[in-house]
């Protein structure tokens, strides 16, 4: 590159204590240097601004990828909120239904327990009543034993 | 640093008025500047070449991070999503399971109305019945009287 | 820009072709370049360390907020997790329910048949009983028998 | 001290070639504009050639142009003349001096004799 | 290129006499004058740089003057080692060009 080229031989420009005028030559190689530094630089600069502006140009594109992404992770935080509470009313709302079956599980125990006494009531008048009949004076006017005599064999 | 230094003394060069020739000892001042300032360059463009690479690696590890963030973003989303999906699938199914047991109530509530006058019935009949025994012709073919009369009672 | 100058008038130091000495005002126009050249690199790389220093703090900045919004995402992804199990214990409980609801109906459905079978059972008895009581020997001693008969019917 | 020591010069035909050498050594070479000079037998001094002390400017007599070529070799402390298409009127001893600005050719080697002839 | 005129081409002297040896340019040099010595078989050797200035080791008996276009060599008491030829050369400008010299000879 112009900028790293070896400056090297003007160092030591006639180390001896004459004075010696400088050759036009040496101030033309001079001139070429830092006409070419100039060049460099300006190059560079060039270059420089361009890559920083590219740099910047993504940094905004970043910021903005950066509000969205957040947005996006806000709304998310938020669904997710509104989504906790719809399980939470979910939760109370099964929990609910669940004492509800619990209750009505209760409720259908006790009404069994009923329905074996109103069973067992109900097969004892059965057998009561078949004693009933058929204790009856044998009559051709009481047709109703035999029926009901069928009805409980 | 060399890109710093006071470069002012080439303002007077040559002290001699009459001079037409540029003295050795002043191109020498030059050619260091020129020198330095090439070095100072050379810093610099190293340099800032070396940030600039450090800063596009950064705004590329930025990027692929990004990327990840998004995707993350984008599965958290979409879980979300599901999730939202699941827990009205839950809200219906909760609300069938409510109706449901709303229902089974209702029959429950029936079933015991049911019950209570199935009770009032069979309470009449035992009544009758007992009253029907205790009024028959007292016969010792009738043992059961004693016996319904007890179970009544 | 000084960095921007035309340095072209280098090239042709010194009208005299024939001179090998460089004239004073020649080094004096390279001197005067230089120092140009060395103020605009000097404005360069401080406007440029400028920017890169920008740069760095807004590539600091991101990395914060990458992390913050990384360690947001984390936890939207834990808080989901819990949500999905959270929900995976609500449709567990919901199915518990829900089969309870049908053992319960199932359990209802039966003793609905049991309370028909026993209905049927209560009327039978009721229409023996009946046809009992009007087949009895007409006698004062049984009052029952008008108040069965209109129970009945 | 300062010395310099020419080589290479012998006959050559006419349209031949002949490089020339010249080693210095008790001062900074790399410092120094070098320049050969000829002086034809019985004749007066010529100046020929002569390099900038980083061997990129260079500059030649018209008689010379485009047939001879400096060079140098600071790494070597050595200057040389290429000479091709030589004539009879390029005999001459051939020296090598150092060339201070404006305080002239304070330094000579003691020559070397170039003869162009069929 | 500038044209160095060199006056007498050659010139009988004795010890002891005091001799000039001129130089004209055909163009203003200032001072960029410089004056050789050359004897038979040997290199030539700067005695005078810039017009007046002695080259280390030369004889102060030697001296230079003139500027501009016009300029003379002067040996004070010539000294037998003196007769030799001499060659002025300008270093204004390029091509570098020498005098056609002066041979000083013992009468």
């Known amino acids: 590159s112009r900028i790293d080229q070896d400056n090297s031989s003007f160092d030591s420009l006639s180390p001896e204590p004459k004075s010696r005028f400088a050759m036009l030559d040496d101030v033309k190689i001079l001139a070429n240097g830092l006409l070419q530094l100039g060049h460099g630089l300006k190059d560079f600069v060039h270059k420089t601004k361009g890559q920083i502006n590219d740099i910047f140009q993504k940094l905004n594109i970043f910021d903005q990828s950066f509000y969205d992404l957040s947005l996006q992770t806000s709304e998310i935080k938020e669904e997710e909120k509104e989504l906790r509470r719809t399980t939470y009313k979910l939760q109370v709302k099964n929990e609910e239904v669940k004492n509800m079956s619990l209750e009505l599980n209760s409720k259908l125990e006790s009404l069994l327990e009923e329905k074996i006494l109103l069973q067992q009531k109900v097969k004892y008048l059965e057998e009561q009543l078949t004693n009933l009949i058929q204790n009856q004076p044998e009559t051709p006017e009481h047709p109703e034993v035999t029926s009901l005599k069928t009805f409980v064999e | 640093s060399r890109i710093d230094q006071d470069n002012s003394s080439f303002d007077s060069l040559s002290p001699e008025p009459k001079s037409r020739f540029a003295m050795l000892d002043d191109v020498k001042i030059l050619a260091n500047g020129l020198l330095q300032l090439g070095h100072g360059l050379k810093d610099f463009v190293h340099k800032t070449k070396g940030q600039i690479n450090d800063i596009f690696q950064k705004l590329n590890i930025f990027d692929q991070s990004f990327y990840d963030l998004s995707l993350q973003t984008s599965e958290i989303k979409e879980e979300e999503k599901e999730l939202r999906r699941t827990t009205y699938k839950l809200q219906v199914k909760n609300e069938e399971v409510k109706n449901m047991s709303l229902e089974l109530n209702s029959k429950l509530e029936s079933l015991l109305e049911e019950k209570i006058l199935l009770q009032q019935k069979v309470k009449y009949l035992e009544e009758q019945l007992t009253n029907l025994i205790q009024n028959q012709p007292e016969t010792p073919e009738h043992p059961e009287v004693t016996s319904l009369k007890t179970f009544v009672e | 820009s000084r960095i921007d100058q035309d340095n072209s008038s280098f090239d042709s130091l010194s009208p005299e072709p024939k001179s090998r000495f460089a004239m004073l005002d020649d080094v004096k126009i390279l001197a005067n370049g230089l120092l140009q050249l060395g103020h605009g690199l000097k404005d360069f790389v401080h406007k440029t360390k400028g920017q890169i220093n920008d740069i760095f703090q807004k590539l600091n900045i991101f990395d914060q907020s990458f992390y913050d919004l990384s360690l947001q995402t984390s936890e939207i992804k834990e808080e989901e997790k819990e949500l999905r199990r959270t929900t995976y214990k609500l449709q567990v409980k919901n199915e518990e329910v829900k089969n309870m609801s049908l053992e319960l109906n199932s359990k209802l459905e039966s003793l609905l048949e049991e309370k028909i079978l026993l209905q049927q059972k209560v009327k039978y008895l009721e229409e023996q009983l009946t046809n009992l009581i009007q087949n009895q020997p007409e006698t004062p001693e049984h009052p029952e028998v008008t108040s069965l008969k209109t129970f009945v019917e | 001290q300062v010395q310099l020591v020419e080589s290479g010069g012998g006959l050559v035909k006419p349209g031949g070639s002949l490089r020339l050498s010249c080693a210095a050594s008790g001062f900074t070479f790399s410092d120094y504009y070098m320049s050969w000079i000829r002086q034809a037998p019985g004749k007066g001094l010529e100046w020929v050639s002569y390099?900038?002390?980083?061997?990129?400017?260079?500059y030649y007599a018209d008689s010379v142009k485009g047939r001879f070529t400096i060079s140098r070799d600071n790494a070597k402390n050595s200057l040389y003349l290429e000479m091709n298409s030589l004539r009879a009127e390029d005999t001459a001893v051939y020296y090598c001096a150092r060339d201070s600005s404006q305080l002239g050719f304070d330094y000579w080697g003691q020559g070397t004799l170039v003869t162009v002839s069929s | 290129d500038i044209q160095m005129t060199q006056s007498p081409s050659s010139l009988s002297a004795s010890v002891g006499d005091r001799v000039t040896i001129t130089c004209r340019t055909s163009?203003?040099?200032?001072?960029?004058l410089n004056w050789y010595q050359q004897k038979p078989g040997k290199a030539p050797k700067l005695l005078i740089y810039?017009?007046?200035t002695l080259q280390s080791g030369v004889p102060s008996r030697f001296s230079g003057s003139g500027s501009g276009t016009d300029f003379t060599l002067s040996i004070n008491s010539l000294q037998p080692e003196d007769f030799a030829t001499y060659f002025c050369q300008q270093t204004y400008s390029n091509p570098l060009t020498f005098g056609g010299g002066t041979k000083l000879e013992i009468k």
């Open positions: 810039t017009t007046s």
């Open positions: 390099i900038g002390s980083s061997g990129v400017n260079m």
């Open positions: 163009q203003n040099i200032i001072n960029f």
